[in-house]
Amino acid sequence: LNTTVLQGMAGQSLRVSCTYDALKHWGRRKAWCRQLGEEGPCQRVVSTHGVWLLAFLKKRNGSTVIADDTLAGTVTITLKNLQAGDAGLYQCQSLRGREAEVLQKVLVEVLEDPLDDQDAGDLWVPEESSSFEGAQVEHSTSRNQETSFPPTS
């Protein structure tokens, strides 16, 4: 499973959309978690509504919001007021009982707001986004950038 790389500016919002096979994942809740290390468990940040039919309702934990469009097969996570400490590796998951299937791995990069940094030239964003093989890199500097990931096979 490839890791998707998303960039957001500190203080702004980053929206992540993970798509999945709506039939295969029928009836399953979705979750967003932080991967603190390869060996350790993925630490749950937020999950969709406990009643699957109400999964379209937004669920919030702190500054992270999740909502699931179960018909379209798209779960959307919004990281509001992005902080430096939010940078890291995350997963979109589909929950089945106590088991969790990884829908997408997401590496979140938080960039300094140039307006907060008088020497903004010191923050370097490469022109070539594909400098890391196997990683999709998307620059998100708008307040509501939405990125859709293709369904995983």
Epitope: R34, L36, V125, G134, A135
Partner: antibody, heavy 115, light 107 residues
Framework: QVQLQESGPGLVKPSETLSLTCTVS????????WSWIRQPAGKGLEWIGL???????IYNPSVKRRVTMSVDTSKNQFSLKLTSVTAADTAVYYC?????????WGQGTLVTVSS | EIVLTQSPATLSLSPGERATLSCRAS??????LAWYQQRPGQAPRLLIS???NRATGIPARFSGSESGTDFTLTISSLEPEDFAVYYC?????????FGQGTKVEIK
């Protein structure tokens, strides 16, 4: 098991450029972030900066006008360059994987700034 | 930048005793705090992440807690290999910063 190994000159002259490379083995460099941290003898730890998967960098303001970090994915390496060094830059330099926290470290390399 | 102040600077204890190390942040770090152990001549090792989560392979005698901007590392019963320097580190805001360290030495 991920392993990190720092390499580079152990002695650098004042006003010259310190250059170090960190080689990552046992895993791909491309799915994580990577930091440099230094420790003067008998003192505490100072974070120098990090390089993201995309190649974007965040530097500590204390050194940001003198520091450059880069990555070479084909060699599974990332590097540090620190210009205009002085005796105050003498320290053990560590590279580390920055996955929310520094979970893997190199063993460190001592760099002495002296003429 | 966020300043982390560790206390005491040195803690003199005997094996089997309980060690309590403190780290105070100059502002909120939202639980984004870690503890590291550094033995002489070695690189630091991650013990605790997110203020209270033990890292993989770390013995249960190590535990972390928080109360606002005050963080505590507790070693319930010191083993000979636990005598080392301990650092706290925040990654709530750039630049990532470390405390100045607490040395746990044999009494």
């Amino acid at each position: 098991q991920v392993q990190l190994q720092e390499s580079g000159p152990g002695l650098v002259k004042p006003s010259e450029t310190l250059s170090l490379t960190c080689t990552v083995s046992g895993g791909s460099i491309s799915s994580y972030y990577w930091s440099w941290i230094r420790q003067p003898a008998g003192k505490g730890l100072e974070w120098i900066g990090l390089i993201y998967t995309s190649g974007s960098t965040i530097y500590n303001p204390s050194v940001k006008r003198r520091v450059t970090m880069s990555v070479d994915t084909s060699k599974n390496q990332f590097s540090l360059k620190l210009t205009s060094v002085t005796a105050a830059d003498t320290a053990v330099y560590y590279c580390a994987r920055d996955l929310f926290y520094f979970d893997y470290w190199g063993q460190g390399t001592l760099v002495t700034v002296s003429s | 930048e966020i300043v982390l102040t560790q206390s005491p600077a040195t803690l003199s204890l005997s094996p089997g005793e309980r060690a309590t190390l403190s780290c105070r942040a100059s502002q909120s770090v939202s639980s984004y705090l870690a503890w590291y152990q550094q033995r002489p001549g070695q690189a630091p090792r991650l013990l605790i992440s997110d203020a209270s989560n033990r890292a993989t392979g770390i013995p249960a005698r190590f535990s972390g807690s928080e109360s606002g901007t005050d963080f505590t590392l507790t070693i319930s019963s010191l083993e000979p290999e636990d005598f080392a320097v301990y650092y706290c580190q925040q990654r709530s805001n750039w630049p990532w910063t470390f405390g100045q360290g607490t040395k746990v030495e044999i009494k």
